[in-house]
Interface confidence: low
């Protein structure tokens, strides 16, 4: 290409501005958007070969307009070549305030590490300025419109653009992507590459063999009718500069997941077990949900299996509504769109003892006037094995009178089935309820028993008792 590796002085767009003496040497300064130009010298006529100025601030009407000379316009070159180009301007001496020339690309100022030099050619009429720009080993990202900006007397002047077109091997803007597909189900792959130079032609490759005999113009969509095993696909992009090959992508066939592993019990209570697991390989398809299977371990025969469904994430589930002090076998299975995995290895887990499920029975309350105490008696409730070992009772007694309300409770050990509590208020009603306590917690309170505490020594009580329900312990 004519413009590649060309000397700077051959790149000047049009003749050098003004007439320079034969032995005149320019002086140069590295480019800076803040550089000040040297003071102008003497007046000179304005050259005709100039670009129409693009004014972005109010221009002074008292001075002749200045504008950049026409640029080279369009440079075409191959990747990795060097390119040099310039913009130039003539500033008559009548202009007192001039700032340095700045280079812009695609609307953004080029600051920092760009090789640019500004050369000044002063004479008696003013100064000619040539801003030289070079790019070593151009890349596709150097493609674009370059232009110069300069402020003269607070007026911003913009040069015509120089379009730099870098040609090279095809460049992928869309490569095929790895996908996971259902066995024997059709799917599409897309490949798109661009120049310049155009056109770009695409060949598809499957497991190192070309799929299409004739190339397709980019962009290309390959429809694969279906696969029965994993395959690797890529695409070749061809243009006049040569060939580029995309990354190879694996197309995986979806299968059922592997079973979960590392099933652990994180916490147990009387009626729940918190279980965690590590999902197995997902079979190239996202896990959708998991199933926790629970069966009683103590049953001699194969008891029924309880199934609890949950989302695939988090890998955690609290199994509820279990019996207290019971042993269970637990396993986990997960599914994807293809199907369910095998179950994980079964693990053993136990619930802790529960709280009593029945309240104490036959509660009676008497007032012992002489000692000013209430005598409370009851019958031990029928506590099941899984309710745990009885450790005591809680007695709730509430005292109510005209202006007073007192709610108190006592805990007594399991020895015996009676208790005495001091009278708190006279001329009041006392309501008594009792609950049994095991290591698993506190059970339900009994039905309330009321007794009226007289002001003096008269007693009117209801020694009502709670009826003993049938023993349900089997």
């Amino acid at each position: 290409e004519k413009w590649e590796e060309t000397e700077l002085d051959q790149l000047f767009s049009g003749p050098l501005p003004g007439r320079l003496p034969v032995n005149h040497r320019p002086f140069s300064a590295p480019h800076s958007s803040r550089d000040q130009l040297p003071p102008p010298q003497t007046g000179r006529s304005h050259p005709a070969h100039t670009a129409a100025p693009q004014v972005t601030s109010t221009a002074s009407k008292l001075l002749p307009p200045v504008a950049f000379n026409h640029t080279i316009g369009h440079i075409v070159l191959s990747e990795h070549k060097n390119v040099k180009f310039n913009c130039s301007i003539n500033i008559p001496n009548t202009y007192q305030e001039t700032a340095g020339i700045s280079w812009w690309k695609d609307g953004k100022e080029l600051l920092g590490a760009h090789h640019s030099i500004t050369q000044f050619y002063p004479d008696e009429e003013g100064v000619s300025i040539i801003a030289l720009f070079s790019i070593a080993s151009v890349q596709r990202s150097d493609n674009g419109s370059y232009f110069c900006k300069m402020k003269v007397n607070n007026r911003e002047i913009v040069s015509d653009p120089i379009y730099v077109e870098v040609q090279g091997l095809p460049y992928f803007i869309k490569q095929p992507e790895s996908v996971n597909v259902t066995r024997n189900t059709a799917f599409n792959l897309t490949c798109q590459a661009v120049g310049p130079p155009e056109p770009v032609n695409i060949f598809w490759v499957q497991n190192s063999s070309r799929v299409n005999e004739k190339p397709e113009r980019s962009p290309s969509v390959l429809t694969v009718p279906g696969l029965t095993e994993t395959a690797v696909f890529s695409c070749e992009a061809h243009n006049d500069k040569g060939l580029t090959v995309s990354k190879g992508v694996h197309i995986n066939i979806k299968v059922i997941p592997s079973p979960p592993t590392e099933v652990h019990i994180l916490n147990s209570t009387a009626h729940s077990i918190l279980v965690s697991w590590v999902p197995g390989f997902d079979g190239y398809s996202p896990l959708q949900n998991c199933s926790i299977q629970v069966k009683e371990a103590d049953r001699l025969s194969n008891g029924s299996v309880m199934v609890f469904n949950t989302s695939a994430s988090p890998h955690l589930y609290e199994i509820q509504q279990l019996q207290a002090l019971a042993n269970y076998s637990i396993a986990v299975s997960c599914r994807n769109e293809i199907g369910w995995s095998a179950v994980s290895p079964w693990i053993l887990a136990s619930t802790t003892e529960g709280a009593p499920s029945v309240a104490p029975l036959n509660i009676t309350v008497f007032l012992n006037e002489s000692n000013n105490i209430l005598d409370i008696r009851w019958t031990k409730p029928p506590i099941k094995r899984q309710d745990g070992e009885l450790v005591g009772y809680r007695i709730s007694h509430v005292w109510e009178s005209a202006g007073t309300y007192k709610e108190l409770s006592e805990e007594v050990s399991q020895n015996g089935s009676w208790a005495q509590i001091p009278v708190q208020i006279h001329n009041a009603t006392c309501t008594v309820r009792i609950a049994a306590i095991t290591k698993g917690g506190i059970g339900p309170f009994s039905e309330p028993v009321n007794i009226i505490i007289p002001e003096h020594s008269k007693v009117d009580y209801a020694p009502s008792s709670t009826p003993a329900p049938g023993n349900t312990d089997s």
Epitope: P30, R34, L111
Partner: antibody, heavy 116, light 110 residues
Framework: QSVEESGGRLVTPGTPLTVTCTVS????????MGWVRQAPGKGLEYIGF?????NTYYASWAKGRFTISKTSTTVDLKITSPTTEDTATYFC?????????????WGPGTLVTVSL | DVVMTQTPASVEAAVGGTVTIKCQAS??????LAWYQQKPGQRPKLLIY???NLASGVPSRFAGSGSGTQFTLTISDLECADAATYYC????????????FGGGTEVVVK
């Protein structure tokens, strides 16, 4: 890696003076260089910077009063028309990168005295 | 150009103590701020760059923080050798806004 200034001396007002900074152990095509001065008993004052590709930047007060240029191993600071206010120790310093103007290696400084 | 204002101008602290120096920029400079230490008759030494990054060989007793317009240099476990003048400097878009230094803070160690 080191930098060293030279060329500081007594000059009369209006007489141009160039101070030179010589570098070793690194390339001026990779790193920028800055100039900073310090008047006696005063603080540091940034003058300007030349980046790895030769672009020069100046503090607003220094534009027109100073010119920075470089060769492959030296960086020059020209005081175009010194005044007595330019009496100071002049430091050159290596930038952290091509266009980064923080200075990780400093020279010992060279004293410029401007006096009648 | 950006103007850097440094406070206080002087600070005194005991050995083992902590000193905090503040630097304010006249406009946002991101994190493009450096701190230097200069002892009498010596060249400046880079302590911190990019507001909080410790320069090579600088002890971790020196710490920088801040962004935008407000910056701080903290020197903890003061040593006698820390007696010096400390300067902040912006290098944000140095081509546009300059590389101004703050006025300096003299640290006196008792």
């Amino acid at each position: 890696q080191s930098v060293e200034e030279s060329g500081g001396r007594l000059v009369t007002p209006g007489t141009p003076l160039t101070v030179t900074c010589t570098v070793s152990g690194f390339s001026l095509s990779v790193y920028g260089m800055g100039w900073v001065r310090q008047a006696p008993g005063k603080g540091l004052e940034y003058i300007g910077f030349i980046n790895n590709v030769g672009n020069t930047y100046y503090a607003s007060w220094a534009k027109g009063r100073f010119t920075i240029s470089k060769t492959s191993t030296t960086v020059d600071l020209k005081i175009t028309s010194p005044t007595t206010e330019d009496t100071a120790t002049y430091f050159c310093a290596k930038g952290g990168g091509g266009d980064w103007g923080y200075f990780n290696i400093w020279g010992p400084g060279t004293l410029v005295t401007v006096s009648l | 150009d950006v103007v850097m204002t440094q406070t206080p101008a002087s600070v005194e602290a005991a050995v083992g103590g902590t000193v905090t120096i503040k630097c304010q920029a006249s406009q946002s400079i991101g994190n493009a701020l450096a701190w230097y230490q200069q002892k009498p008759g010596q060249r400046p030494k880079l302590l911190i760059y990019a507001a909080s990054n410790l320069a090579s060989g600088v002890p971790s007793r020196f710490a920088g923080s801040g962004s935008g317009t407000q910056f701080t240099l903290t020197i903890s476990d003061l040593e006698c050798a820390d007696a010096a003048t400390y300067y902040c400097q912006t290098y944000y878009a140095i081509n546009r806004y300059g590389g101004a230094f703050g006025g300096g803070t003299e640290v006196v160690v008792k």
